[in-house]
């Protein structure tokens, strides 16, 4: 069987190429009551089964979970902790199950942990030691190289008193153990900033998706350290222009893929520089499609179709001359 | 099944150019990226470039940037490689091999090979 | 570019003996390193990817281990139809490259 056929979705095969702790060792061919196994495919599916925990007796076989559409509200630590452990368990597809509290090291003891999928869960407590399993400042390495996190933002009400976005980064970015990550999904999660350390510290990253987002700046932002960045999706923000800063450090990533379209470019002054890249770049995918969206007189004109004359700016008057 | 079928043989007088085939089936082709590896006779791997099914995207060694080019065709789930002014030492079986998004340069599954010949 | 030196070039061992190759990277490439083995005639099958990771369908008496610049591809207990060449691959940083190749037969 071959690996998993798209970034994003788990296929029946093993991925890419692959609680308390149960007292007693699963059987080798048990299958947990409401679940589907497959010792050929190494795969158990649990799927839309309302389970309200992680199933006990997972057999030890198994590479690829799928507990999606489910409702377990709480991962606890350990949630997959077993004896013996599941040492196989590469892909783990927790979707649409009604997640709303990821606990510190409930991914714990899944040494061959390659791909999480906790897209879909109105996730208003995400520990900061998710990911890393404790609050040591340098954690033991994950073995994660991609994690999806797509509409993971619970609606407002349910928010706890802090930034959603500094809690995503901090569980990001505890105790280092997220250095290996290669794709990383954040859309459709209301963010309006990226904090500026995320990507420093995720020095592997060949995939990083903020669409569907409410990014206005990408100001304070850097993409240096990211050498092996090969795409970068901005599609579907509130970017109003990319300042010479930002065009410089995408320009100098050797291998990039930018996709910026559907934002609300600003076609003022200062967005002579970004027009002049973008004329020149070989970075920014369907560039040809990026349209202004302010001002009005300028809406709907083709970013690549504008000159030096085009992008002017009102000129700023004086307090005393300015008109309520 | 997985299948990646190449084009047949080829033997090309130095200077000219020769255009490889790869045709893919068995999996979603724009959700692997497709490389191009070479092997000369006895001798070892060499990794020439790949490009991205869903947009065309390439990255190429830069042993080879001027004269290859690297294309696909969604409609027929097909990869191919034209490598330009020939020489002797292009002489080799040109593999195609395909590799996930996020491995990237891991390579599951590759063609049977095309052998290239350079000979005046 | 990253060289990927492999050593030993040629290795004659016996069926039921334990195999080490071993693969030095030119500067840290963490984990991403791959093991493929070619038989005479064919494309190259993917081992072990992720210096450590089996790949799907792979015999377990196949192993990889290490980190930073030094990488091992063992056999743990060789069999007649193991015979082939094994060459290392980095994945860390384009272009990608690969060892010089283990020849490997049966003595």
């Known amino acids: 069987s071959s690996p998993t056929s798209s970034a994003s979705s788990f296929s029946s095969s093993a991925p890419f190429l692959a609680s308390a702790v149960s007292a007693q060792p699963p059987l080798p061919d048990q299958c947990p009551a409401l679940c589907e196994c497959s010792e050929a495919a190494r795969t158990v599916k649990c799927v839309n089964r309302n389970l309200t925990e992680v199933p006990t007796d997972l057999p030890a076989y198994v590479r690829n979970l799928f507990l999606t559409g489910n409702q377990l509200a709480v991962l606890p630590a350990g949630a997959f902790a077993r004896r013996p452990p599941l040492a196989e368990l590469a892909a783990l597809n927790l979707s649409g199950s009604r997640l709303d509290e990821v606990r510190a090291g409930a991914f714990e003891h899944l040494p061959s942990l390659r791909q999480l999928d906790l897209s879909h869960n109105p996730l208003a407590d995400l520990s900061p030691f998710a990911f890393s399993g404790s609050n040591a400042s340098v954690s033991a390495p994950s073995p994660l190289v991609e994690l999806i996190l797509n509409h993971i933002v619970p609606p407002e009400d349910e928010r706890q008193n802090r930034s959603f976005e500094g809690m995503v980064v901090a569980a990001l970015l505890a105790g280092r153990a997220l250095q290996g990550l290669r794709r990383l999904e954040l859309a459709s999660n209301h963010f309006l900033y990226l904090p500026r350390d995320v990507l420093a510290q995720l020095p592997s990253l060949r995939h990083l998706d903020l669409s569907n987002n409410s990014l206005v700046s990408l100001t304070y932002v850097s993409f240096r350290n990211l050498t092996h960045l090969e795409s970068l999706h901005l599609e579907d923000n509130a970017l109003k222009v990319l300042h010479n800063g930002t065009l410089a450090e995408l320009q100098g990533l050797p291998h990039i893929r930018v996709f910026l379209d559907n934002n609300p470019w600003v076609c003022d002054c200062h967005m002579a520089d970004m027009v002049t890249w973008l004329k020149e770049t070989e970075v920014v995918q369907g560039k040809d499609r990026l349209t202004c969206a302010y001002p009005e007189k300028m809406r709907n004109r083709v970013l690549l179709e504008l000159n030096s004359a085009d992008l002017d700016c009102d000129p700023i008057l004086p307090p005393s001359l300015q008109t309520s | 099944q997985v299948q990646l079928v190449q084009s047949g043989a080829e033997v090309k007088k130095p200077g000219a150019s020769v255009k490889v085939s790869c045709k893919a089936s068995?999996?979603?082709?724009?959700?692997?990226?497709m490389h191009w590896v070479r092997q000369a006779p006895g001798q070892g791997l060499e990794w020439m470039g790949r490009?991205?099914?869903?947009?065309?995207?390439?990255n190429t060694n830069q042993k080879f940037k001027d004269r290859v080019t690297m294309t696909r065709d969604t409609s027929i789930s097909t990869a191919y490689m034209e490598l330009r002014s020939l020489r002797s030492e292009d002489t080799a079986v040109y593999y195609c091999?395909?590799?996930?998004?996020?491995?990237?340069?891991?390579?599951?599954?590759w063609g049977q090979g095309t052998l290239v010949t350079v000979s005046s | 570019d990253i060289v990927m030196t492999q050593s030993p070039s040629f290795l004659s061992v016996s069926v039921g003996d334990r195999v080490t190759i071993t693969c030095k990277a030119s500067?840290?490439?963490?984990?991403?390193v791959a093991w493929y083995q070619q038989k005479p005639g064919q494309a190259p099958k993917l081992l072990i990817y992720?210096?450590?990771d089996r790949y799907t369908g792979v015999p377990d008496r196949f192993s990889g281990s290490g980190s930073g610049t030094d990488f091992t591809f063992t056999i743990s207990s060789l069999q007649a139809e193991d015979v082939a060449v094994y060459y290392c691959?980095?994945?860390?940083?384009?272009?990608?490259?690969f060892g010089g190749g283990t020849k490997l037969e049966i003595k």
């Open positions: 992720f210096a450590s």
């Open positions: 691959q980095q994945d860390y940083s384009s272009p990608p490259t």
């Open positions: 500067q840290s490439v963490s984990t991403d």
């Open positions: 490009v991205s099914p869903n947009n065309g995207a390439t």
């Open positions: 068995g999996y979603s082709f724009t959700d692997y990226y």
């Open positions: 091999a395909r590799s996930t998004m996020i491995t990237s340069y891991y390579f599951d599954y």
